[in-house]
C-alpha cells in the first residue's frame, strides 16, 4: 500500500529532521519568518487523488532539493543529512509509482499547475531568507522547523488520502 | 492517543527539594520539547522552563533557573522537574505541556498537574 | 520580560451574546508576518485548553465561534455566540520572546 508507505516514510523524515537540530531553536526566535505556506494546497478536498499525489511530489522533491545543497550539507550532521535526503528519495520513488498506478484508474487525471506553482514559490521564498541570512545558523533552524510543518502537513493530506481509498 | 501522566501530590517542608514526574505516550517523546508551567492557587500561569527530550537541551525562565532542575529520561518516556529549596511560594499546581506547532511554541497537550505543598 | 494585561478581568455575559476579550502586549509579539499570541480556555478543575494560535488560528476541533484578531502589541480573543460550556477563565500567552509569559486571565460567567 503506497499511502502507507508514505506516511510512514514521512514520519521517518519527521524523525530525522528533528534529530537534526544543532542549536537551540530559543537562540532563534527573532529570526521566525512566515513562509506563507500553501496551506490550501493541502486540505485534500478539491484534489482528485492523482492531483493530491502530484502536490505531495512537488513538495518532497523541492524539500530534497534544498537539503541536497552545498549550504545544506555545510549546516547539518552529514549521517542524519545522507539518512533524511534517502528517506525523501525513497518517497518520491513511491509517490511517482503512485501516480502511475492512479493515472491508470481515474479518467482524466488533471495536472494542477496552479498548486504545484504555489509550492515551488513558497520554497523560493525559503530559498530566498536562506540566501538574505547568508546561511547562518539560525536561519537553517528556522527553515527545518518550517519543513517540519509542512512536511506534518503532507503527512495529513496522505492520511485524508488513505481514508478515501 | 496522547497522554502526559503526572505524579501524585507532594507535601514538603520549606529548604526541602522535591522531584516530580510526567510520563509521556502516544507520541515521539524524543522529537518534541516539553514545557513545564505553574499555576499558584487561584491565580494566573508562569512558564518555567522547556526540554528537549531527544538531547536533553534546557531553555528556562531565568525567574526559575535557581529553582528548577528539567530533566529526561527517553527509556522511559519520562520528564522531571527538580525543585530545590521549597519556600511558600513555590506551593502550587506544576503542568508538563507539549511543545506544539514546532516554533510556534504554543502547547497542545497538557498533564493533569502536580500539586506541591510546601509547609513546616 | 514581556507583560501580558488582559481586560477586562471578568465579564458576565448574556448566553448568545458576544464577549470580547483583550490582551495587550508591553512590547510587540510580532515579527515579519507572524503574530505570537496565543488563546487558552481553562475550565474550574481542568487543564488549560489552546483555543487559537498565532493570534487568529483556530485550533482543531474549537468550535467556530471562538475568533481571535489583532497584531503588534493588542489582541482580541471573540467568543459569538457565547454558549453555557464557555464558562471559564480564558489566558492569552506569547512566544515572541524569551520568557514566554501568560496574561492575569479574564473570568467569564454566563448570565
Known amino acids: 500500500d503506497l499511502p502507507q508507505t508514505h506516511s510512514l516514510g514521512n514520519r521517518r523524515a519527521l524523525i530525522l529532521l528533528a534529530q537534526m537540530g544543532r542549536i537551540s531553536p530559543f537562540s532563534c526566535l527573532k529570526d521566525r519568518r512566515d513562509f506563507g505556506f500553501p496551506q490550501e494546497e493541502f486540505d485534500g478536498n478539491q484534489f482528485q487523488k492523482t492531483q493530491a499525489i502530484s502536490v505531495l511530489h512537488e513538495m518532497i522533491q523541492q524539500t530534497f532539493n534544498l537539503f541536497s545543497t552545498e549550504d545544506s550539507s555545510a549546516a547539518w550532521e552529514q549521517s542524519l543529512l545522507e539518512k533524511f535526503s534517502t528517506e525523501l528519495y525513497q518517497q518520491l520513488n513511491n509517490l511517482e509509482a503512485c501516480v502511475i498506478q492512479e493515472v491508470g484508474m481515474e479518467e482524466t487525471p488533471l495536472m494542477n499547475e496552479d498548486s504545484i506553482l504555489a509550492v515551488r514559490k513558497y520554497f523560493q521564498r525559503i530559498t530566498l531568507y536562506l540566501t538574505e541570512k547568508k546561511y547562518s545558523p539560525c536561519a537553517w533552524e528556522v527553515v527545518r522547523a518550517e519543513i517540519m510543518r509542512s512536511l506534518s502537513f503532507s503527512t495529513n493530506l496522505q492520511k485524508r488520502l488513505r481514508r478515501k481509498d | 492517543q496522547v497522554q502526559l501522566q503526572e505524579s501524585g501530590t507532594v507535601l514538603a517542608r520549606p529548604g526541602a527539594s522535591v522531584k516530580m514526574s510526567c510520563k509521556a505516550s502516544?507520541?515521539?517523546?524524543?522529537?518534541?520539547?516539553m514545557h513545564w508551567v505553574k499555576q499558584r492557587p487561584g491565580q494566573g500561569l508562569e512558564w518555567i522552563g522547556v526540554?528537549?527530550?531527544?538531547?536533553?537541551?534546557?531553555t528556562y525562565n531565568q525567574k526559575f533557573k535557581d529553582k528548577a532542575k528539567l530533566t529526561a529520561v527517553t527509556s522511559a518516556n519520562t520528564a522531571y522537574m527538580e525543585l530545590s529549596s521549597l519556600t511558600n511560594e513555590d506551593s502550587a499546581v506544576y503542568f508538563c505541556?507539549?511543545?506544539?506547532?514546532?516554533?510556534?511554541?504554543?502547547?497542545?497537550?497538557w498533564g493533569q498537574g502536580t500539586t506541591v505543598t510546601v509547609s513546616s | 520580560d514581556i507583560v501580558l494585561t488582559q481586560s477586562p478581568a471578568s465579564l458576565a455575559v448574556s448566553l448568545g451574546q458576544r464577549a470580547t476579550i483583550s490582551c495587550r502586549a508591553s512590547?510587540?509579539?510580532?515579527?515579519?508576518?507572524?503574530?505570537?499570541m496565543h488563546w487558552y480556555q481553562q475550565k474550574p478543575g481542568q487543564t488549560p485548553k489552546l483555543l487559537i494560535y498565532?493570534?487568529?488560528n483556530l485550533e482543531s476541533g474549537v468550535p467556530a465561534r471562538f475568533s481571535g484578531s489583532g497584531s503588534g502589541t493588542d489582541f482580541t480573543l471573540n467568543i459569538h455566540p457565547v454558549e453555557e460550556e464557555d464558562a471559564a477563565t480564558y489566558y492569552c500567552?506569547?512566544?515572541?520572546?524569551?520568557?514566554?509569559?501568560f496574561g492575569s486571565g479574564t473570568k467569564l460567567e454566563i448570565k
Open positions: 526540554i528537549y527530550p531527544g538531547n536533553g537541551d534546557t
Open positions: 505541556t507539549r511543545n506544539y506547532k514546532y516554533d510556534y511554541y504554543t502547547m497542545d497537550y
Open positions: 498565532l493570534a487568529s
Open positions: 500567552q506569547h512566544s515572541g520572546e524569551l520568557p514566554f509569559t
Open positions: 512590547k510587540s509579539v510580532s515579527t515579519s508576518g507572524h503574530s505570537y
Open positions: 502516544g507520541y515521539s517523546f524524543t522529537t518534541y520539547w
